[in-house]
């Protein structure tokens, strides 16, 4: 079972992931981003449910498409190159979701824009941070 120190580490990793996702959202929502309309045409798969750490499997599977869309954005909107940003997120996600490799993601029927996708995972991080004990 997780210890108080491992739970604290999990909280910190979730906060880091939350900040990264918020940074991406702010970057693409930037009024100076001329590629936003184009970026909004890309569709992302949404998790059927996202309440627990194991559901991060669904985020992991969409990181490559996320990187591809971010490559469209002007790099000055982000502190890091999309490849480095997504790599950092991937490391956190892999640690958070654990080694339960047999867990398969199930997706919702409807796809979403990058903004809806990011908002969903931001909500996920916020809710776990507030309820993890």
């Amino acid at each position: 079972a997780p210890t108080s120190s491992s739970t604290k580490k999990t909280q910190l990793q979730l906060e880091h992931l939350l900040l990264d996702l918020q940074m991406i959202l702010n970057g693409i929502n930037n009024y100076k981003n001329p590629k936003l309309t184009r970026m909004l045409t890309f569709k992302f798969y949404m998790p059927k449910k996202a309440t627990e750490l194991k559901h991060l499997q669904c985020l992991e599977e969409e990181l490559k498409p996320l990187e591809e869309v971010l490559n469209l954005a002007q790099s000055k909107n982000f502190h890091l190159r999309p490849r480095d940003l997504i790599s950092n997120i991937n490391v956190i996600v892999l640690e958070l979701k654990g080694s339960e490799t047999t867990f398969m993601c199930e997706y919702a029927d409807e796809t979403a824009t990058i903004v809806e996708f990011l908002n969903r995972w931001i909500t996920f991080c916020q809710s776990i941070i507030s309820t993890l004990t």
């Epitope: 949404m46 059927k48 449910k49 996202a50 750490l53 199930e106 909500t123 507030s130 993890l132």
Partner: antibody
Amino acid sequence: EVQLVESGGGLVKPGGSLRLSCAASGFTFSSYTLAWVRQAPGKGLEWVAAIDSSSYTYSPDTVRGRFTISRDNAKNSLYLQMNSLRAEDTAVYYCARDSNWDALDYWGQGTLVTVSS
Amino acid sequence: DIQMTQSPSSLSASVGDRVSITCKASQNVGTNVGWYQQKPGKAPKALIYSASFRYSGVPSRFSGSGSGTDFTLTISSLQPEDFATYFCQQYYTYPYTFGGGTKLEIK
């Protein structure tokens, strides 16, 4: 057949403690998130705590620091340790299975906890 | 926390009637909504998941609909055993929250 059977309820004084148990059968216990949901007399349902398959635990502000959820996969059992009990904790406590991708699909019959002096 | 506002809180109807119960979420919850039936002194029983899918063994007269913030449970033709209290629940995010319940009574 999935079965969840709660036990451990009873009368306790304010400030006291109680430990509830839930014995599970009919499914691969270790693979599921389990939850406790309570219902005060004549009232609605309130989610109290959950524990996932990795034993990470989740609970709302109302019980955090007082209630602790735990599980023993070897015994197919779920527990709720309730400390510093208050009159407003009086309720029927249900154990429920949280399906991986959907709602709370199976519920136990409940156990009544009464907090009164 | 996400609030689930259920209406009506009570409803009188007759056997054979068609009835609908609504639930409104305080924010978008996609289709992460379940419906439960509870009879006096008994545990809740899961009826509907993902807003519109019936659990195995649930009669076809029960149907769910909705997405986003507005959800409906409909019983197409009330049977005597359907008189009970019904609850909606969101499982979009922790903490899970429930509607206040709708008590369905015989007219």
